[in-house]
């Protein structure tokens, strides 16, 4: 997760847009990835690379467990 | 309306440091980045850098050398700009700006004049 | 660091006719075909008033003599028809990224 991450922030060279999407990192199990962008006010770009960064990680981490539970099986 | 009002004149020697204020208004004061500006006498537009006040994010011209802070304190709507160790080339106006979009500076301040002199 | 090239440094001008000033980047400031530079027009004692954002988008109040264009690393500010208020200093200026770099300016008189 960490390594796609980094890869993703590192095309965005403003360091506002490059938080905004470590931001969307975070997890938050009571919203989605578009209800917490849509609170953002600071410009699209921010919304943007928020959005990209929350649903690559909500995805890996979605395939991660799905993984664990086949393991489990 | 927007506005962003700037503190007066100053005039401080060298070695000493500068604080300039920015008291932001006709906005939601958290919403948009501000930036710091300078221009020398006869010379053109400097970036020192900028803070999102919602989150505190800063980041600074690497030409201050560590020399620049910038703060907020969103209870009264002002940003703040710290120079220190003043040197005499360090004379100039000193501007605040309110970014849109993460784009373009569509609001400046008057601009404060510092002075720097033995 | 991004440096932005301003040209010419200082121009003359008569009343009617067309200003053109370029503004080079030393590298693309195209993000997925957004164009982060913008023009700001500056007359002495007062701070910088923004022109045109986006290369070529002209801000509200902004009289349509003045125009952008230009993308990737060229762009263009063009005055036409000057008129004598727009003797003042231009600046171009670019928020691709970190550090926010300023072009040297371009001092327009009119004749």
């Known amino acids: 997760l960490q390594e796609k991450i980094e890869e993703i922030a590192a095309k965005y060279k403003h360091l506002v847009v490059k938080k905004c999407c470590y931001d969307g990192v975070r997890i938050n199990h009571d919203e989605t990835c578009e209800q917490r962008a849509a609170r953002i006010s600071v410009g699209p770009r921010c919304v943007k690379a928020f959005t990209e960064c929350c649903v690559v990680a909500s995805q890996l981490r979605a395939n991660n467990s799905h993984k664990d539970l086949q393991l489990g099986r | 309306q927007v506005q962003l009002v700037q503190s007066g004149a100053e005039v401080k020697k060298p070695g000493s440091s500068v604080k300039v204020s920015c008291k932001a208004s006709?906005?939601?004061?958290?919403?948009?980045?501000i930036h710091w500006m300078r221009q020398a006498p006869g010379q053109g537009l400097e970036w020192m850098g900028y803070?999102?006040?919602?989150?505190?994010?800063?980041n600074y011209n690497e030409n201050f050398k560590g020399r620049v802070t910038i703060t907020a304190d969103k209870s009264t709507s002002t940003a703040y700009m710290e120079l220190s160790s003043l040197r005499s080339e360090d004379t100039a106006v000193y501007y605040c700006?309110?970014?849109?979009?993460?784009?373009?500076?569509?609001?400046w301040g008057q601009g404060t004049t510092v002075t720097v002199s033995s | 660091d991004i440096v932005l090239t301003q040209s010419p440094a200082s121009l003359a001008v008569s009343p009617g006719q067309r200003a053109t000033i370029t503004c080079k980047a030393s590298?693309?400031?195209?993000?997925?075909?957004?164009?982060?530079m913008n023009w700001y027009q500056q007359k002495p004692g007062q701070p910088p008033k923004l022109l045109i954002y986006?290369?070529?988008n002209l801000d509200s109040g902004v009289p349509a003599r003045f125009s952008g264009s230009g993308s990737g690393t060229d762009f263009t500010l063009t005055i036409n028809p000057v008129e004598a208020e727009d003797t003042a200093n231009y600046y171009c200026?670019?928020?691709?990224?970190?550090?926010?770099?300023f072009g040297g300016g371009t001092k327009v008189e009119i004749k």
């Open positions: 700006a309110r970014e849109r979009n993460l784009e373009y500076f569509d609001y």
């Open positions: 006709g906005y939601t004061f958290t919403d948009h980045i």
């Open positions: 803070i999102y006040p919602r989150e505190g994010w800063t």
């Open positions: 590298q693309s400031v195209d993000y997925e075909g957004f164009n982060y």
């Open positions: 986006a290369a070529s």
């Open positions: 200026q670019q928020s691709n990224e970190d550090p926010y770099t």
